[in-house]
Structure formats: structure tokens, C-alpha cells
């Protein structure tokens, strides 16, 4: 049985204020059943960045087509970057539970930092 891997290829992503940042995340299996969510930070105080199923995330778009079948690409784009967006971003697989989903596996994280302003 293939064990699920959460792949976040970039350890560090340098971004520019006002631009769009792309955070990559791919998975190697559709199992276990359950959604993938994006967070900034870890622990109980982490911030939910994107949940495709519910919520309103006006600055976030998905890289893959949301009508695509059996999607394994959970990359996102965050527009209009500000200094407040810096931090480490994690894509996290949840296992479907009833009533609550349970965290199953997290990617290694991508640190978003501000790069030098273009001259």
C-alpha cells in the first residue's frame, strides 16, 4: 500500500510586496479519505489560509482546476502580498471523521519571506 506523502518542494519562498505568491503542494495518494487544508504556523494558534469546501478566502486561488477529477495538486496562489503574510505555510491532509475531521499528515512547510524590492 502506498503511504501518503505530502510534498512541499520549496523550503523557502522569497516574495515581493504587492505580487502573487505560489505555494506548491502535491500528494502521492488520494487516501485516506478527507480534505487538504492550508495553514500558516503550527499548533492551536495556527491560521487557516484555505479550505476549498467552506469559508471565504478572497486572496487565495487554486492552481489546479476545481472540476478536475482525482486531483493530487493542492497548490495555491496568494495575491497582493503584504509584510503581514510572512511565515511558514503548511498543507495538511485530514482524515474524514464523523463529525470532526482529524489531522492525518502535514507537509514539511514552506517559509515565505520578503525578498528585496525590485529596483
Amino acid at each position: 500500500e502506498e503511504e501518503l506523502q505530502m510534498i512541499q518542494p520549496e523550503k523557502l519562498l522569497l516574495v515581493t510586496v504587492g505580487k502573487t505568491a505560489t505555494l506548491h503542494c502535491t500528494v502521492t495518494s488520494l487516501l485516506p479519505v478527507g480534505p487538504v487544508l492550508w495553514f500558516r504556523g503550527v499548533g492551536p494558534g495556527r491560521e487557516l489560509i484555505y479550505n476549498q469546501k467552506e469559508g471565504h478566502f478572497p486572496r487565495v486561488t487554486t492552481v489546479s482546476d476545481l472540476t478536475k477529477r482525482n486531483n493530487m495538486d493542492f497548490s495555491i496562489r496568494i495575491s497582493s502580498i503584504t509584510p503581514a503574510d510572512v511565515g511558514t505555510y503548511y498543507c495538511v491532509k485530514f482524515r474524514k471523521g464523523s463529525p470532526e475531521n482529524v489531522e492525518f499528515k502535514s507537509g514539511p512547510g514552506t517559509e515565505m519571506a520578503l525578498g528585496a524590492k525590485p529596483s
Epitope: 487516501l31 476545481l66 477529477r69 486531483n71 493542492f74 482524515r95
Partner: antibody, heavy 120, light 108 residues
Framework: DVQLVESGGGVVRPGESLRLSCAAS????????MSWVRQAPGEGLEWVST??????YYADSVKGRFTISRDNSKNTLYLQMNSLRAEDTAVYYC???????????????WGLGTLVTVSS | EIVLTQSPATLSVSPGERVTFSCRAS??????IAWYQQKPGQAPRLLIY???SRDTGIPDRFSGSGSGTDFTLTISSLQSEDFGVYYC??????????FGGGTKVEIK
């Protein structure tokens, strides 16, 4: 081509057991969730159970009596049915789950079904 | 549990006619609806998923629409091979996955 072939159906008495099998081919069996859906004679479709990796889900009507399992080395899905009742009489379909977007499962391929009859 | 109500229960139609099926959910399911066709003695066949996306190989006379609680499956011009029973299914909130009771399409 995706193929799902069920077997193991038959006639049993109330309280007895039966084990259904579903042989799958034509896709990467181990990375997909799989389900059983049943249809009583002349009735509509009723979801029975789904299995992911080792995560399993059941309809209330079968919880505690039915057990879904899979053997990825054999590309086979199973449904162990214990304490069978007359109301379990149905055609049992094996179905491959498909996801869309970032979550949400439906059934994109179905087997032809196997008939289970529970009668005294 | 989300209840899906399909109407009408039966439709009597002539080939070439436009046919519309309704599926109403007891609560918001966004666009997490699939439609299946089942012919007598056969397994169900996926037609539409995500409310409006046609499955591979499904003729374009089949179309789906709707979001929230009200969904529609339309066959623009019914062919003789389209007779059978049509089911909707929700996958927004499960377990359990739930199906509508079906709409039977018969020859007028």
C-alpha cells in the same frame, strides 16, 4: 479499461453470514477509496460502506454487522456481512470512488452487482 | 442526514423531446451533486458530477445545473437509449452518502 467484478452473493437464512468480493482491474486500486452500494428489488440505491486506506465508513443500517476491507496486493474489495436480515436482500454493487476538487466523493465505475437474498 | 427529493417520480416522454429532472436537497450541498443513469438489469452509470461536469464519454445532450439546494438534469433531445431511471447523489456531507429516490423515464 476499469473493471469491477463482484462475487459471493447467494441465498442465506436470517442470522447467517456471507462474504462478498469485488475484483478490480484497469486502475491503481491502492490509491482510491472503494464502496459498496446496494439496491433492494424494485427500489432505489442505498450506500452501504466505503473504505479508504484503513479508514472505514458505514451506513447506520449495517453498522456493527458488516465489515468492509481490502487487499491491495490482490486488487480486491470485500464485504463481510454477518447477522443478515430479510431487509438486507438486494443487489450489492462494488463502486470505485472518485474525488473532485479538493474533497467530495462520488462513484465513477460500478460492477454489475451480485444478488444477496436473505430468506427463511 | 441530507435528504434528496427527486421529481417527478415518473416521466412519460417521446423520443426527441426535451426532458428535465429535478433534485432538491434538504440543506445546502453547494455543487456536490452527481447524477446517474440506470437501465433495467444494469449497473448505474455516472453522467454528471460537481452538478454540471459531464463524465468522460457522456453525450452533450446531457447537462446539469444548479447549486445550493436545487439541481436539474436536462436531456436536450431524448434518444431511445436514454430510457431508464435517473438518480441524484450528494457527497457534500457524509456519511451517509445519500441518493434521491429516482425518476423513471418511460416511453409515452
Amino acid at each position: 479499461d476499469v473493471q469491477l467484478v463482484e462475487s459471493g452473493g447467494g441465498v442465506v437464512r436470517p442470522g447467517e453470514s456471507l462474504r462478498l468480493s469485488c475484483a478490480a482491474s484497469g486502475f491503481s486500486f491502492s490509491i482510491y477509496a472503494m464502496s459498496w452500494v446496494r439496491q433492494a428489488p424494485g427500489e432505489g440505491l442505498e450506500w452501504v460502506s466505503t473504505i479508504g486506506a484503513d479508514d472505514t465508513y458505514y451506513a447506520d443500517s449495517v453498522k456493527g454487522r458488516f465489515t468492509i476491507s481490502r487487499d491491495n496486493s490482490k486488487n480486491t474489495l470485500y464485504l463481510q456481512m454477518n447477522s443478515l436480515r430479510a431487509e438486507d436482500t438486494a443487489v450489492y454493487y462494488c463502486a470505485k470512488d472518485s474525488t473532485v476538487g479538493w474533497s467530495g466523493d462520488f462513484f465513477d465505475y460500478w460492477g454489475l452487482g451480485t444478488l444477496v437474498t436473505v430468506s427463511s | 442526514e441530507i435528504v434528496l427529493t427527486q421529481s417527478p417520480a415518473t416521466l412519460s416522454v417521446s423520443p426527441g423531446e426535451r426532458v428535465t429532472f429535478s433534485c432538491r436537497a434538504s440543506q445546502n450541498v453547494r455543487s456536490d451533486i452527481a447524477w446517474y443513469q440506470q437501465k433495467p438489469g444494469q449497473a448505474p452509470r455516472l453522467l454528471i458530477y460537481a452538478a454540471s461536469s459531464r463524465d468522460t464519454g457522456i453525450p452533450d445532450r446531457f447537462s446539469g445545473s444548479g447549486s445550493g439546494t436545487d439541481f436539474t438534469l436536462t436531456i436536450s433531445s431524448l434518444q431511445s437509449e436514454d430510457f431508464g431511471v435517473y438518480y441524484c447523489q450528494q457527497y457534500y456531507d457524509w456519511p451517509p452518502f445519500t441518493f434521491g429516490g429516482g425518476t423513471k423515464v418511460e416511453i409515452k
